[in-house]
Interface confidence: medium
């Protein structure tokens, strides 16, 4: 869920999760267009991961799962079902991805009308 997403991002990366709430074309609710930078690509990848989880019958934004922040790393589990496993992997992936990025202030509160209608395909 959203709480776990914020927690995992805070565990691994140097910035507050709030820094990604309205960033670029994909960080925040919804998303379309061409990702603006590495951070935006992380968020695009996470959107794709959540889409795959939804296709598997999961509820990414609301479903809770167990995880631990150990040594600045996300440890998933113990999972009670496949959805919890998938969702933790999605959040773990974006947390690791964001931790390796440079932050570009110019993409904070980026106007959505500047984002193209079409988006890159998910892997």
């Amino acid at each position: 869920g959203i709480l776990e997403l914020a927690g995992t991002v805070g565990c691994v990366g140097p910035r507050t999760p709030i820094a990604y709430m309205k960033y670029g074309c994909f960080c925040g609710l919804g998303g379309h267009g061409q990702p603006r930078d590495a951070i935006d690509w992380c968020c695009h990848g996470h959107d794709c991961c959540y889409t795959r989880a939804e296709e598997a019958g999961c509820s990414p934004k609301t479903e809770r799962y167990s995880w631990q922040c150990v040594n600045q790393s996300v440890l998933c589990g113990p999972a009670e079902n496949k959805c919890q496993e998938l969702l933790c992997k999605c959040d773990q992936e974006i947390a690791n991805c964001l931790a390796q990025t440079e932050y570009n202030l110019k993409y904070l509160f980026y106007p959505q009308f500047l984002c193209e209608p079409d988006s890159p395909k998910c892997d």
Epitope: G10, Q68, C69, N71
Partner: antibody
Framework: QIQLVQSGPELKKPGETVKISCKAS????????MNWVKQAPGKGLKWMGW????????TYAEEFKGRFAFSLETSASTAYLQINNLKNEDTATYFC??????????????WGQGTTLTVSS | DIQMSQSPASLSASVGETVTMTCRAS??????LAWYQQKQGKSPQLLVY???NLADGVPSRFSGSGSGTQFSLKINSLQPEDFGSYYC?????????FGGGTKLEIK
């Protein structure tokens, strides 16, 4: 209570090797990173690097790459700092410090008492 | 690497006075900064984390402020046990460097 207890003072000659230990107690050793900090006589603190206690993966600050090695004996909740080919400028007090890395709680919350290393011919 | 600079390098003050020391970073740290106190011959002790949060057991006369690249540690009504060296340390990205320290001495 939580404690980090380091090995005693060391007197070594240039070119020798030293291994300093840091034994942790009072918490789950593999849940927190272990950091090493150098303090030369009369000088400030220098972060040497840290070791992930759940994987044993070390990270070294640039200045401490090469002759310095972090290791673990997880079963004994002990971290080690080994310095090879000792030089006079290695004379310092070395601290181990437990790292808490969950934002915003990022800090070194428990420190060892320090191990004084003197390198002299 | 992020450079941390502390000022002043040394400071003398009397018991009861208020002192402020600063820490500057070469890059935006947001609030990823901690302050430590170290007394002669002892290990450092955590005072403040996340720039403004007092660690457990730290007296309320200590306070941290700032974000981004400029941070301060303020000590109100100095007590005899407050004298020693103070270090800031960033936790933005490794290496987690320390500032050069501020030595607080009794006037």
């Amino acid at each position: 209570q939580i404690q980090l207890v380091q090995s005693g003072p060391e007197l070594k000659k240039p070119g020798e090797t030293v291994k300093i230990s840091c034994k942790a107690s009072g918490y789950t050793f593999t849940n927190y990173g272990m950091n090493w900090v150098k303090q030369a006589p009369g000088k400030g603190l220098k972060w040497m690097g840290w070791i992930k206690t759940n994987t044993g993966e070390p990270t070294y600050a640039e200045e401490f790459k090469g002759r310095f090695a972090f290791s673990l004996e997880t079963s004994a909740s002990t971290a080690y700092l080994q310095i090879n080919n000792l030089k006079n400028e290695d004379t310092a007090t070395y601290f181990c410090a437990r790292g808490n890395y969950y934002r915003p709680r990022r800090y070194f919350d428990y420190w060892g008492q320090g191990t004084t290393l003197t390198v002299s011919s | 690497d992020i450079q941390m600079s502390q000022s002043p390098a040394s400071l003398s003050a009397s018991v009861g006075e208020t002192v402020t020391m600063t820490c500057r970073a070469s890059e935006n740290l947001y609030s990823n900064l901690a302050w430590y106190q170290q007394k002669q011959g002892k290990s450092p002790q955590l005072l403040v984390y996340a720039a403004t949060n007092l660690a457990d057991g730290v007296p309320s006369r200590f306070s941290g402020s700032g974000s981004g690249t400029q941070f301060s540690l303020k000590i109100n009504s100095l007590q005899p046990e407050d004298f020693g060296s103070y270090y800031c340390q960033h936790f933005y990205v490794t290496p987690y460097t320390f500032g050069g320290g501020t030595k607080l001495e009794i006037k």
